[in-house]
């Protein structure tokens, strides 16, 4: 299976971890598939929920992925890049705050450039409840990590804010920032940020980034 949409269409309609195959390759990767939300078929590419996994990782770790697909994890930039360059994908970002509220941002078009172009993110067609303005700067920025500084700041955003992300200078979001528990999650400049929903100092409780073919 190339993605969770193919898994779903093959008759596997239960949430869980499935083995996916890189496009035009035999290389495999394990991913969590959400087969319930919004019709199912979603490939989860990022999840934060409890702070159990360190997201201050190297370029290579963000490239190949890390964490546990059943919990907190990053699927891997290389796989996502290859996948989203095969056909048109949508990206849905689901967010939870500490007060029991939920919101989402849905981008009708999403792809990552190749590693040679630093996995630059490309997004279009924003809808959803997590802000009318995109909290991922547009047009998209290159991906940066603690050992791969590609941002637009004279500072090093990834080191300052922690985590790998498509930093601008440094920009209005970072879903891979430090995980702060409840009551420590305000005035957290290096936390899990989605500015156009909760502002700059608020660190979120949970986030999920998921993709699905646009023609699903």
């Amino acid at each position: 299976f190339r993605d969770c949409a193919e898994v779903f269409k093959s008759g596997h309609t239960t949430n869980g971890i499935y083995t996916l195959t890189f496009p035009n390759s035999t290389e495999e990767i394990k991913a969590y598939c959400d087969m319930e939300a919004g019709g199912g078929g979603w490939t989860i590419i990022q999840r934060r929920e409890d702070g159990s996994v360190d997201f201050q990782r190297t370029w290579k770790e963000y490239k190949v992925g890390f964490g546990n697909p059943s919990g907190e994890y990053w699927l891997g930039n290389e796989f996502v890049s290859q996948l989203t360059n095969q056909q048109r994908y949508v990206l849905k970002i689901h967010l939870k705050d500490w007060e029991g509220n939920e919101a989402y941002s849905l981008y009708e078009h999403f792809y990552l450039s190749s590693e040679e172009l630093n996995y630059r993110i490309h997004l279009k067609g924003l809808t959803g409840t997590a802000g009318k303005i995109s909290s991922i700067s547009q047009p998209g920025n290159d991906f940066s990590t603690k050992d791969g500084d590609n941002d637009k700041c004279i500072c090093k955003c990834s080191q300052m804010l922690t985590g790998g992300w498509w930093f601008d200078a440094c920009g209005p979001s970072n879903l891979n920032g430090m995980y702060y528990p409840q009551r420590q999650n305000t005035n957290a400049f290096n936390g899990i940020k989605w500015y156009y929903w909760k502002g700059s100092g608020y660190s979120l409780k949970a986030t999920t980034m998921m993709i699905r073919p646009a023609d699903f």
Epitope: Y111, S113, L117, H122, K124, G125, L126, Q138
Partner: antibody, heavy 121, light 107 residues
């Protein structure tokens, strides 16, 4: 710096085909983004004609779909416009431009200087 | 396709004036609207993208705003070199479409 340069005949006869070339320097057309053709009619009206993406996929304006073809030569870093069965209404200045998104239409950040094409017998 | 209705067609202003151009989309274009400047004898130049983001190197006297169907472009203090035609463009849906243009003339 990224530069685009259009070239092709300035005069085309009605019912013939219009063929233009856009030569790109400073960026590989196979790396990223979409590579567009836009035309500007006398009176300044702008019309997007279509693009070829870095991956080679194409998208065309439905108003031209039966007449238009956009192709590329990656070895020369060029992309091409062919417009068939032209009429005097196709008289315009033709621009090539790079758009900021590779798989869909978007704003265009680099433009060629344009080439004027007259359709007349 | 989305029709972009741009007004006014002509603006006659003095240096130092503030000018505003509007574009109305026939259906929602979200914030996927760009503004271009075309000086005489030149190709269009991107000024504003995603409705309100200034493109690299564009002076801060140029601003854009709007969401959905109503979009505004403004020049806070017009200078002589701003003599040009200004176009809006939506790229929310394909095909992308342009407004008819606003010609800015300096008195």
């Amino acid at each position: 710096d990224v530069q685009l340069q259009e070239s092709g005949p300035g005069l085309v006869k009605p019912s013939q085909s219009l063929s233009l070339t856009c030569t790109v320097t400073g960026y590989s057309i196979t790396s990223d983004y979409a590579w567009n053709w836009i035309r500007q009619f006398p009176g300044n009206k702008l019309e997007w004609m279509g693009y070829i993406s870095y991956s080679g996929s194409t998208s065309y304006n439905p108003s031209l779909k039966s007449r238009i073809s956009i192709t590329r030569d990656t070895s020369k870093n060029q992309f091409f416009l062919q417009l068939n069965s032209v009429t005097p209404e196709d008289t315009a200045t033709y621009y090539c431009a790079r758009s900021t998104f590779g798989h869909y239409v978007s704003s265009m950040d680099y433009w060629g200087q344009g080439t004027s094409v007259t359709v007349s017998s | 396709s989305i029709v972009m209705t741009q007004t006014p067609k002509l603006l006659l202003v003095s240096a130092g004036d503030r000018v505003t151009i509007t574009c109305k989309a026939s259906q929602s274009a979200s914030n996927d609207v760009a503004w271009y400047q075309q000086k005489p004898g030149q190709s269009p130049k991107l000024l504003i993208y995603y409705a309100s983001n200034r493109y690299t190197g564009v002076p801060d006297r140029f601003t854009g705003s709007g969401y959905g169907t109503d979009f505004t472009f403004a020049i806070s203090t017009v200078q002589a070199e701003d003599l040009a035609i200004y176009f809006c463009q939506q790229d929310y849906s394909s095909p992308p479409t342009f407004g008819g243009g606003t010609k800015l003339e300096i008195k």
